[in-house]
């Protein structure tokens, strides 16, 4: 297993609709054809997997149908979008990239993107 540098923004504020997008960029040492991207969430020192996708270079990322993540790839960059976020989902979202094929296997883990999520203010009741 060889190490690889992964860069991602430090802080992102999700939209009022609970959507956060960020780029995860990896310094590919070679010409990988198969890449796996995993998003991990760290909150209160617990780490959980949010979503994962394996893709062939030049193809779209395919997450599971019920995943809250979508993404696109361009060269050594993966543009990740996480939706359906609420205030309780605020936390550090870590991008993990694995170059699966061809060998050698490379692994890179970013420092994480702190995603802040603000629940929208409830609309005041109105009489019709």
């Amino acid at each position: 297993c060889k190490a690889m540098h992964v860069a991602q923004p430090a802080v992102v504020l999700a939209s009022s609709r609970g959507i956060a997008s960020f780029v995860c960029e990896y310094a590919s040492p070679g010409k990988a054809t198969e890449v796996r991207v995993t998003v991990l969430r760290q909150a209160d020192s617990q780490v959980t997997e949010v979503c994962a996708a394996t893709y062939m270079m030049g193809n779209e990322l395919t997450f599971l149908d019920d995943s809250i993540c979508t993404g696109t790839s361009s060269g050594n960059q993966v543009n990740l979008t996480i939706q359906g976020l609420r205030a309780m989902d605020t936390g550090l979202y870590i991008c993990k990239v694995e170059l699966m094929y061809p060998p050698p296997y490379y692994l890179g883990i970013g420092n994480g993107t702190q995603i802040y999520v603000i629940d929208p203010e409830p609309c005041p009741d109105s009489d019709f």
Epitope: P9, A10, V11, V12, L13, A14, S15, S16, S21, F22, A43, D44, A87, L92, G112, Q114, Y116, I118, D119
Partner: antibody
């Protein structure tokens, strides 16, 4: 080193607007947020809101909603805070601060805004 | 809104003494999102502690933070002359982010 340098002191009349700038250096500007905090004379710190430089999303304190706008110019690594319809109780030192994962660091040197007729 | 109440309002101590500052939240705060700042007259605040207990870069080890839930503490083990200042806690756990009203540590 990481540094935030703010614009100079301003004197404004009630009802006017003020726009304070905060120039960042020593780090990747788009990777962090910028928060604004004010401090009235002899008082404590009041959080005004912040902007996620990466995507331009903002979160304002409710009491200032509609009067405050926070923006950035990524080409010059500068953040701006505009406060409109100024009142005498807006007289304060206004600080910008870099927002990290769970901290404000560093802070700008502060900009005194005086609202007086 | 989460209200942070700091106590005491003023702490009168001598250099070399131990200072214990309290910050109590009106609702539970994730310890990941509680910070402490120091402010001296005419200066901008300076980050001391983040994540309730992690010291910021360049902060001497006489400063320590602890606590969870609604009760947090900043401790200065041995006061140095340069430590006499106002100290603020802040929470980022829930919007709006809020500061405590401050504790002034003054020379006795």
């Amino acid at each position: 080193q990481v540094q935030l340098v703010q614009s100079g002191a301003e004197v404004k009349k009630p009802g006017a607007s003020v726009k304070v700038s905060c120039k960042a250096s020593g780090y990747t500007f788009t990777s962090y947020g910028i928060s604004w905090v004010r401090q009235a004379p002899g008082q404590g710190l009041e959080w005004m809101g912040w902007i996620s430089v990466y995507n331009g999303n903002t979160n304002y304190a409710q009491k200032l909603q509609g009067r405050v706008t926070m923006t950035t110019d990524t080409s010059t690594s500068t953040a701006y805070m505009e406060l409109r319809s100024l009142r005498s109780d807006d007289t304060a030192v206004y600080y910008c601060a870099r927002v990290g994962a769970n901290w404000f660091d560093p802070w700008g040197q502060g900009t005194l805004v005086t609202v007086s007729s | 809104e989460i209200v942070l109440t700091q106590s005491p309002g003023t702490l009168s101590l001598s250099p070399g003494e131990r200072a214990t500052l309290s910050c109590r939240a009106s609702q539970s705060v994730s310890s990941s999102y509680l910070a402490w700042y120091q402010q001296k007259p005419g200066q901008a605040p300076r980050l001391l502690i983040y994540g309730a207990s992690s010291r910021a870069t360049g902060i001497p080890d006489r400063f320590s933070g602890s606590g969870s839930g609604t009760d947090f503490t900043l401790t200065i083990s041995r006061l140095e002359p340069e430590d006499f200042a106002v100290y603020y806690c802040q929470q980022y756990s829930r919007s709006p982010w809020t500061f405590g009203q401050g504790t002034k540590v003054e020379i006795k």
